[in-house]
Interface confidence: medium
């Protein structure tokens, strides 16, 4: 009888563990969906506002190829920076290539000098992997040079010619990016 009760208890425990795993997966999925939704809204907002504007980029944004960039005027923590970009139909900068990195660092030198600028890169708390905001991994040449010693969440930033990492709660300037409007000519 005791063995039977013990077996049932173990089965229930196993079931509970499975449910917890499912809940965790669902929570992750929900978070991912919320982020995707934000991206869609940002993209739609960008498309609509651009339709009323003949120039490829809004005032005070810098254009390079198909992208428009905005360099912030005040400091923010990483999460607030991302919110600010999303509000403007853009996202924190996602660096796709060395060419883009060179353009950004060259432009920053001209505009502001050697400060810290948040980009859309953060470290996954569980796996320690670096991820851009769209969930993709940076190319090997674009991984932050130094691993932050912070016990808190770690995010990526650009300084001079380097991609570095820091506690996401520190204050930095930030860079937003959105698609440039294609000329209809």
């Amino acid at each position: 009888k005791l063995l039977q009760v013990s077996t049932i208890a173990m089965q229930q425990q196993e079931k509970l563990i499975q449910q917890e795993r499912a809940l965790l997966n669902f929570t992750e999925w929900k978070r991912s969906c919320a982020l995707q939704m934000k991206y869609c809204q940002a993209f739609m907002q960008n498309s609509l506002s651009s339709a009323h504007n003949s120039s490829p980029c809004p005032n005070n944004w810098i254009q390079n190829r198909e992208s428009c960039y905005y360099v912030s005027e005040i400091w923010s923590i990483w999460h607030t920076s991302q919110e600010n970009c999303l509000k403007e139909g853009s996202t924190l900068l996602q660096i796709e290539s060395k060419e883009e990195m060179d353009f950004i660092t060259g432009s920053l030198r001209k505009i502001k000098g050697s400060y810290d600028y948040w980009v859309g890169l953060s470290q996954d708390g569980h796996s320690g992997r670096w991820l851009w905001q769209d969930g993709s991994s940076p190319s090997p040449g674009l991984l932050p040079a130094e691993r932050s010693q912070s016990a808190n969440q770690v995010c990526g930033y650009v300084k001079s010619n380097s991609l570095l990492s820091s506690n996401c709660s520190t204050w930095k300037y930030f860079i937003c990016e959105k698609y440039a409007l294609r000329s209809s000519v």
């Epitope: 809004p58 005032n59 005070n60 005027e73 005040i74 600010n84 509000k87």
Partner: nanobody, 117 residues
Framework: QVQLVESGGESVQAGGSLRLSCAAS????????MAWSRQAPGKEREFVAR????????DYADSVKGRFTISRDNAKNTVYLQMNSLKPEDTAIYNC??????????SGQGTQVTVSS
């Protein structure tokens, strides 16, 4: 076009208090982050405090934490910086700034704070 006008800066003794105000005109600033920064002669600009549009989130530089308080009155389109336990190293020109996309850097002319020992 947004105009920002700072006021309230003056000379005080170390340990004293001041309240700086930043009045905005030309546009409602209630949706925008606001910040106070300062620059002492020969030094780089330093951001000392930031407040979110709704006023629910504030951040402070380590050098002023526990002494300075940023607040805003969106009905009056004004942001404040309450500065207590002032130190000589707080001497600087204080500017208020706002983050408005698609616009130049909106920053006032500044107000001078001098703290003597």
């Amino acid at each position: 076009q947004v105009q920002l006008v700072e006021s309230g800066g003056e000379s005080v003794q170390a340990g004293g208090s001041l309240r700086l105000s930043c009045a905005a005109s030309g546009r409602t600033i209630s949706n925008y982050d606001m910040a106070w920064s300062r620059q002492a002669p020969g030094k780089e600009r330093e951001f000392v405090a930031r407040i979110s549009g709704s006023g629910d989130r504030t951040d402070y530089a380590d050098s002023v934490k526990g002494r300075f308080t940023i607040s805003r009155d969106n009905a009056k389109n004004t942001v404040y910086l309450q500065m207590n336990s002032l130190k000589p190293e707080d001497t600087a020109i204080y500017n208020c700034q706002t983050q408005i996309f698609g616009s130049p850097n909106f920053s006032g002319q500044g107000t001078q704070v001098t703290v003597s020992s």
